[in-house]
Amino acid sequence: FVRTKIDTTENLLNTEVHSSPAQRWSMQVPAEVSAAAGDAAVLPCTFTHPHRHYDGPLTAIWRAGEPYAGPQVFRCAAARGSELCQTALSLHGRFRLLGNPRRNDLSLRVERLALADDRRYFCRVEFAGDVHDRYESRHGVRLHVTAAPRIINISVLPGPAHAFRALCTAEGEPPPALAWSGPALGNGSAAVPSSGQGHGHLVTAELPALNHDGRYTCTAANSLGRSEASVYLFRFHGASGAST
C-alpha cells in the first residue's frame, strides 16, 4: 500500500509503504475542465471511503450549480455486487457515466456541449444496504465551455428625436468584443460603445445615434474567431431594413 505524506512541510510526492490505514471519505476533482461548444467533455471524479470492500447497493449522482441542493443532471444505481450502474436520470440524454463507481470512479461524460453547460458540477455517491453513508464533492469541477462568437440579434430601433439606434447582441466564450462600423463611423471600424455590457456569455453593444443612411456592421471577435452581421438604414423610405 502506498501512502502519500500530507505533512505540508514534506514533499507531497514522497511515498512510503505502510500497512493499509483506514481510508476516510474524500473526493478528488480537478479545478476545471475546458471544452468547446459542440464537443464532449469528461468531468473526472474519484473518491475514497472508509468502508473496506463495500459491495452493497450504491447510487452515483451528479448535480449542477451548487452542492447538495443543485438540480441533478445524472443519476445511476448499482445493485449489490453489480458493477453495472443503471442510469436513472440523464438530463436531455447528454450525460453518461464513464467511470466505475465500484472502483471509486464517478467520472461523467457530457455530450454536445452548449454555452449553457458552463457551470460547476458536483459528484456524489451514496451507499445503502448494510452501510448507510454518502459523500459529495464540496467544491466541484467547473466546466468551462468555449465558443467562437455568434451574433444572436442585431436590430435598428427608434430613438429619441426621430433618430434611430442600433443594438447588437452576441454570445461567445471568452465573451466577444463588439465593434460597430458604418457610415461616418471612421475607418470601417468603431470602438466598442461605452454602453456595451456583458451578461454571462452575452455581450450587447448599442450604437446610440445612426446619423446617416447605409449599412451598419457589428463585428464580434474573441480568441476563437469572429462573426459579422449588418443592418441597413434607409430613412428616406421612412423605415429601416435589416439584413444579417
Epitope: 502506498v2 478528488q28 480537478p30 479545478a31 475546458s34 469528461v42 474519484t46 471509486n104 467544491h139
Partner: antibody, heavy 124, light 113 residues
Framework: QVQLVQSGAEVKKPGASVKVSCKAS????????MHWVRQAPGQGLEWMGW????????NYAQRFQGRVTMTRDTSISTAYMELSRLRSDDTAVYYC?????????????????WGQGTSVTVSS | DIVMTQSPDSLAVSLGERATINCKSS????????????LAWYQQKPGQPPKLLIY???TRESGVPDRFSGSGSGTDFTLTISSLQAEDVAVYYC?????????FGQGTKLEIK
C-alpha cells in the same frame, strides 16, 4: 524505485495504427493515473490523455478523440496507447508518465516518473 | 484551453550565474478553494524524457537541487536557477494542471554562455 519501460521504436505507413506499451514497476500500478504525452521532432510536449488503471476510465485530449485508445492490463502492470489512422504529423516520441495518486485529496496531477519514450515514425 | 507562453525561447547564461525563465498562462491557474497554483516545471535534457522539478508553482520535487526555485501566482510564474551548473543545460517546460486538457509551454532552451 519507480520505473516505466516502454516498447521499442516503430515505423508505420500513413493510415496504419500503432500500439505502444508501458510496463510499470516499483509502485502499485492501480494507485496512479497514467498519462501519455508526445513530442514531435524538435517540438514541445503535448498531452494526449490519461487512463485510470484502477477503474479503466479514460480522458483524451479533444484533438485525439476518435483516434486514440488507452487501455491497461493490471495483471502485468502495463498501460497501452493505440493511435489509429496515422498521419505524417504523428511522427513523434511518445511517452507514458505516472500521474496523480488516486487517494490524495488535492488534484496534484503532475507527472513524476516518465518512460524512456517510444519513437514512432510515420512515412510512406 | 489554457495557453502557456514561456519567455525567452532560449537563454545563454554563464556558469555560476542566475538563470530566470518566465511562464505566463492565458487564464489564472490559482484555485481559490485551496489557494494553490496548479503549475509545474519540468527539465528535459537532450535524448531524455522530461523530469519533474517543481509543482504547486514553488514546491521542489524530492531530489531536486535547491538552486532550483519556482515563484509566481495567478498567471505569471518564474523558474530560477540561482547558480547555473553545467548539468543544467536543458529545455525547461512549464505545465498547468488546473484545467483539462493539460497544456505545456513551448519550452525554453538554456545554454551556457
Amino acid at each position: 524505485q519507480v520505473q516505466l519501460v516502454q516498447s521499442g521504436a516503430e515505423v508505420k505507413k500513413p493510415g496504419a495504427s500503432v500500439k505502444v506499451s508501458c510496463k510499470a514497476s516499483g509502485y502499485t500500478f492501480t494507485d496512479y493515473y497514467m498519462h501519455w504525452v508526445r513530442q514531435a521532432p524538435g517540438q514541445g510536449l503535448e498531452w494526449m490523455g490519461w487512463i485510470n488503471p484502477n477503474s479503466d476510465g479514460t480522458n483524451y485530449a479533444q484533438r485525439f478523440q476518435g483516434r486514440v485508445t488507452m487501455t491497461r492490463d493490471t495483471s502485468i502492470s502495463t498501460a497501452y496507447m493505440e493511435l489509429s489512422r496515422l498521419r505524417s504529423d504523428d511522427t513523434a516520441v511518445y511517452y507514458c508518465a505516472r500521474g496523480r495518486l488516486l487517494r490524495f485529496f488535492d488534484w496534484l496531477d503532475v507527472m513524476d516518473a516518465w518512460g524512456q519514450g517510444t519513437s514512432v515514425t510515420v512515412s510512406s | 484551453d489554457i495557453v502557456m507562453t514561456q519567455s525567452p525561447d532560449s537563454l545563454a547564461v554563464s556558469l555560476g550565474e542566475r538563470a530566470t525563465i518566465n511562464c505566463k498562462s492565458s487564464r489564472s491557474v490559482l484555485y481559490s478553494s485551496n489557494n494553490k497554483n496548479y503549475l509545474a516545471w519540468y527539465q528535459q535534457k537532450p535524448g531524455q524524457p522530461p523530469k519533474l522539478l517543481i509543482y504547486w508553482a514553488s514546491t521542489r520535487e524530492s531530489g531536486v537541487p535547491d538552486r532550483f526555485s519556482g515563484s509566481g501566482s495567478g498567471t505569471d510564474f518564474t523558474l530560477t536557477i540561482s547558480s547555473l551548473q553545467a548539468e543544467d543545460v536543458a529545455v525547461y517546460y512549464c505545465q498547468q494542471y488546473y484545467s483539462i486538457p493539460y497544456t505545456f509551454g513551448q519550452g525554453t532552451k538554456l545554454e551556457i554562455k
